[in-house]
């Protein structure tokens, strides 16, 4: 058993049918010695008396808010949560496996640049009685500070007969050095509590591996005289690291017809302009990627050919 926060404790339970459970001793936070009784949640049934209460925690029915009283007055509370292990594996019931980029991916994180700021998000089908707490550091043995905000509900969507909820959190490395080679990964830890169930999820990454630039901005077309060709131009996104001479992007320019079946013409360039043939009813899209490290491409920025 360990303390998650004041008066909230997590019991680690290795569960299997007929498991003996964990013996837990609760102590009433009071100078009083006599006449103390214990109850669980809203029940008035007295579970025991005395300054300590010994319970055998075998299942969620044994978790909850234990309260010690004297003469009708509440003395203190202890909320017991369960962290359940089955077949040697800690439960991961609260969050949905996003399966991207691999199975058992519960947390996904992205950074728009090398500033040390990043966003992580996760999915759940649970709508109520749910809390998250996020901590982060660079490295784990001698951790350097990363400050995370509060996790917030960022999207809701319907998937079949299921409603899915997306939560996200923003974090910032306290002493980020954008140009430095990373040797220690960022560690992100999410505590999830649903009703009386505690679970924790972790992710470890280098900022360079989670970079996803914003789409190029100010995408414009300039027709070339007496030609079906156009000059496409764009700019680096505002959120990208500076100076651009050091933090350089490469770009992919795509001409796509109205039909998805039509052949796509693609041009790769390090410049912020390109000349392409603009077909009728086609659209031109441009996306960006770090020039020197193959992390994610940005989303497309698009304009119609007409």
């Amino acid at each position: 058993i360990w303390e998650l926060k004041k008066d909230v404790y997590v019991v680690e339970l290795d569960w299997y049918p007929d498991a003996p459970g964990e013996m837990v001793v609760l102590t009433c936070d009071t100078p009083e010695e006599d006449g103390i009784t214990w109850t669980l949640d809203q029940s008035s049934e007295v579970l025991g008396s005395g300054k300590t209460l010994t319970i055998q925690v075998k299942e969620f029915g044994d978790a909850g808010q234990y309260t010690c009283h004297k003469g009708g007055e509440v003395l203190s509370h202890s909320l017991l949560l369960l962290h359940k292990k089955e077949d040697g594996i800690w439960s991961t019931d609260i969050l949905k496996d996003q399966k991207e980029p691999k199975n058992k991916t519960f947390l996904r994180c992205e950074a728009k640049n090398y500033s040390g700021r990043f966003t992580c998000w996760w999915l759940t089908t649970i709508s109520t009685d749910l809390t998250f707490s996020v901590k982060s550091s660079r490295g784990s043995s001698d951790p350097q500070g990363v400050t995370c905000g509060a996790a917030t509900l960022s999207a809701e969507r319907v998937r079949g007969d299921n409603k899915e909820y997306e939560y996200s959190v923003e974090c910032q490395e306290d002493s980020a050095c954008p140009a430095a080679e990373e040797s220690l990964p960022i560690e992100v830890m999410v505590d999830a509590v649903h009703k009386l169930k505690y679970e924790n999820y972790t992710s470890s990454f280098f900022i360079r591996d989670i970079i996803k630039p914003d789409p190029p901005k100010n995408l414009q077309l300039k027709p070339l005289k007496n030609s079906r060709q156009v000059e496409v131009s764009w700019e680096y996104p505002d959120t990208w690291s500076t100076p651009h001479s050091y933090f350089s992007l490469t770009f992919c320019v795509q001409v796509q017809g109205k039909s998805k079946r039509e052949k796509k013409d693609r041009v790769f360039t390090d410049k912020t302009s390109a000349t392409v043939i603009c077909r009728k009813n086609a659209s031109i899209s441009v996306r960006a990627q770090d020039r020197y490290y193959s992390s994610s491409w940005s989303e497309w920025a698009s304009v119609p050919c007409s």
């Epitope: 569960w15 299997y16 049918p17 949640d41 299942e59 969620f60 029915g61 909850g64 089955e86 019931d93 089908t125 649970i126 079949g160 007969d161 299921n162 409603k163 649903h194 009703k195 009386l196 169930k197």
Partner: nanobody
Framework: EVQLVESGGGVVQAGESLRLSCAAS????????MGWFRQAPGTEREFVGT????????YYADSVKGRFTISRDNAKNTVFLQMSSLKPEDTAVYYC????????????????WGQGTQVTVSS
């Protein structure tokens, strides 16, 4: 929200078997841990057993262990309670419930309940 409807209750002789079904509709059934409870006249609702969302683990009250078996078919949104070697003291209204916590024997931990089906075991 999940709506639950029990069926399969009836009158049987002691020592016989009965299979109860609980059909779920509404939100995704496979997200929920499912439990069975029972209530005899003049008594509190009593835990019978529960099955986890994947159907891989079950947990039973001592009074029914070895006689009752819970299973589920997530493709058909149904949970079953197979009762054998029935005794007169098994007479009760049987309720199906859906919740998020497995295992739990407390009704507090179940969010959705069916209306119940009567099982009578005569001697």
């Amino acid at each position: 929200e999940v709506q639950l409807v029990e069926s399969g209750g009836g009158v049987v002789q002691a020592g016989e078997s009965l299979r109860l079904s609980c059909a779920a509709s509404g939100r995704s059934f496979s997200n929920y841990e499912m439990g069975w409870f029972r209530q005899a006249p003049g008594t509190e609702r009593e835990f019978v057993g529960t099955i986890n969302r994947r159907g891989s683990s079950t947990y039973y009250a001592d009074s029914v262990k070895g006689r009752f078996t819970i299973s589920r078919d997530n493709a058909k949104n149904t949970v079953f309670l197979q009762m054998s070697s029935l005794k007169p003291e098994d007479t009760a209204v049987y309720y199906c419930a859906a919740g998020w916590l497995f295992p739990s024997s407390l009704s507090r931990d179940y969010d959705f309940w069916g209306q119940g089906t009567q099982v009578t075991v005569s001697s």
